[in-house]
């Protein structure tokens, strides 16, 4: 019962976690404009893994996708890859874990097979959670680095003067969603691995017992001929099996003190 509960809970926790990872990956608020120095900004900017958005104080919002893969920072590509790998592994893990659930009967699937599937899905959830946590952490590191590097400077550029505004970006909601979701997926995976131990059928250690007829040496020779053990004559009146049908009298014609115990 405890195993089923652990497995079920692990599945549910992982399901919530993976849903969170998908949500975080799709969210636009990975980095949001820091309004500490300029709280009365007419236009507010926030960015995600796939597009950048601007929002007016009126609430009107416009989002545009990033130009090309080539023009984007390598770190952003790495974050995208980590999140997608996390989602894919998590989705496969969920699929595997559905069939592994103890409460679901599929044909004549043995407990050992279910245990293996539970372990497999558990490992997948753990890796999925780690991918999500790693992806979010890499992006957070980019933000922190950028935050301290963004200092206002003026320089002359082509077509006039360009001023790099003191626009600093800070952690968006998606980062927190990603961290929590990754953690839940990881916990769910650990729970599945724990449940696997309980599902695995314990091997019964049978003590090796040697069964032998007390005092009888049985030699077999086909054709109904009486045979000895093959080593000398049958001096000790040992019971002989001839493979044929015999009467009760014949059976008792070779009495031995060990015959009846």
């Amino acid at each position: 019962m405890a195993v089923t509960a652990c497995q079920g809970l692990g599945f549910v926790v992982s399901l919530i976690g993976i849903a969170g990872i998908i949500a975080a990956t799709c969210m636009d608020q990975w980095s949001t404009q820091d309004l500490y120095n300029n709280p009365v900004t007419a236009v507010f900017n926030y960015q995600g893994l796939w597009r950048s958005c601007v929002r007016e104080s009126s609430g009107f919002t416009e989002c545009r996708g990033y130009f090309t893969l080539l023009g984007l920072p390598a770190m952003l590509q790495a974050v995208r890859a980590l999140m997608i790998v996390g989602i894919v592994l998590g989705a496969i893990g969920l699929l595997v874990s559905i069939f592994a659930l103890k409460c679901i009967r599929i044909g004549s699937m043995e407990d050992s097979a279910k245990a293996n599937m539970t372990l497999t899905s558990g490992i997948m959830f753990i890796v999925s959670g780690l991918c999500a946590i790693a992806g979010v952490s890499v992006f957070a590191n980019m933000l922190v680095t950028n935050f301290w590097m963004s200092t206002a400077n003026m320089y002359t550029g082509m077509g006039g003067m360009v001023q790099t505004v003191q626009t600093r970006y800070t952690f968006g909601a998606a980062l927190f969603v990603g961290w929590v979701a990754g953690g839940l997926t990881l916990i769910g995976g650990v729970m599945m691995c724990i449940a696997c131990r309980g599902l695995a059928p314990e091997e019964t250690n049978y003590k090796a017992v040697s069964y032998h007829a007390s005092g009888h040496s049985v030699a077999y020779k086909p054709g109904g001929f009486k045979a000895s053990t093959g080593f000398g004559s049958n001096t000790k009146n040992k019971k002989i099996y001839d493979g044929g049908a015999r009467t009760e009298d014949e059976v008792q014609s070779y009495p031995s003190k060990h015959d009846y115990v």
Partner: nanobody, 120 residues
Framework: AVQLVESGGGLAQAGGSLRLSCAAS????????MAWFRQTPGKQRESVAL???????NYADSVKGRFTISRDNAKNTVYLQMNDLKSEDTAVYYC??????????????WGQGTQVIVSS
């Protein structure tokens, strides 16, 4: 980089009209807002009008009711329709664009300026 090219400046009679335009080109992800500033010799650059990407406008008190700012989002172009011109409107007019150019990159770009002279 983003380039801003102003056009439409020149000589106008008091009470007359001029239409300035500013085209932005280059690596523009989001055009947050575009604005017009002006500067007269010996004075600081002052804001004339601003328009956000959503069309929200803001004008300096001295030009309210006379100037109209508009924009074409598809062309990343901003226009300043100046009516009922006065001699105090004589200045170099600068185009300004607040642009998101990439991931965690938001810059303010300036044009080279276009001269507007109002003769009385």
């Amino acid at each position: 980089a983003v380039q801003l090219v102003e056009s439409g400046g020149g000589l106008a009679q008091a009470g007359g009209s001029l239409r300035l335009s500013c085209a932005a080109s280059g690596r523009i992800l989001n055009m947050a807002s575009m604005a017009w500033f002006r500067q007269t010799p010996g004075k600081q650059r002052e804001s004339v009008a601003l328009i956000t990407f959503g069309g929200t406008t803001n004008y300096a008190d001295s030009v309210k009711g006379r100037f109209t700012i508009s924009r074409d989002n598809a062309k990343n172009t901003v226009y300043l329709q100046m009516n009922d011109l006065k001699s105090e409107d004589t200045a170099v007019y600068y185009c300004n664009a607040d642009v998101v150019t990439g991931l965690m990159r938001r810059d303010v770009y300036w044009g080279q300026g276009t001269q507007v002279i109002v003769s009385s």
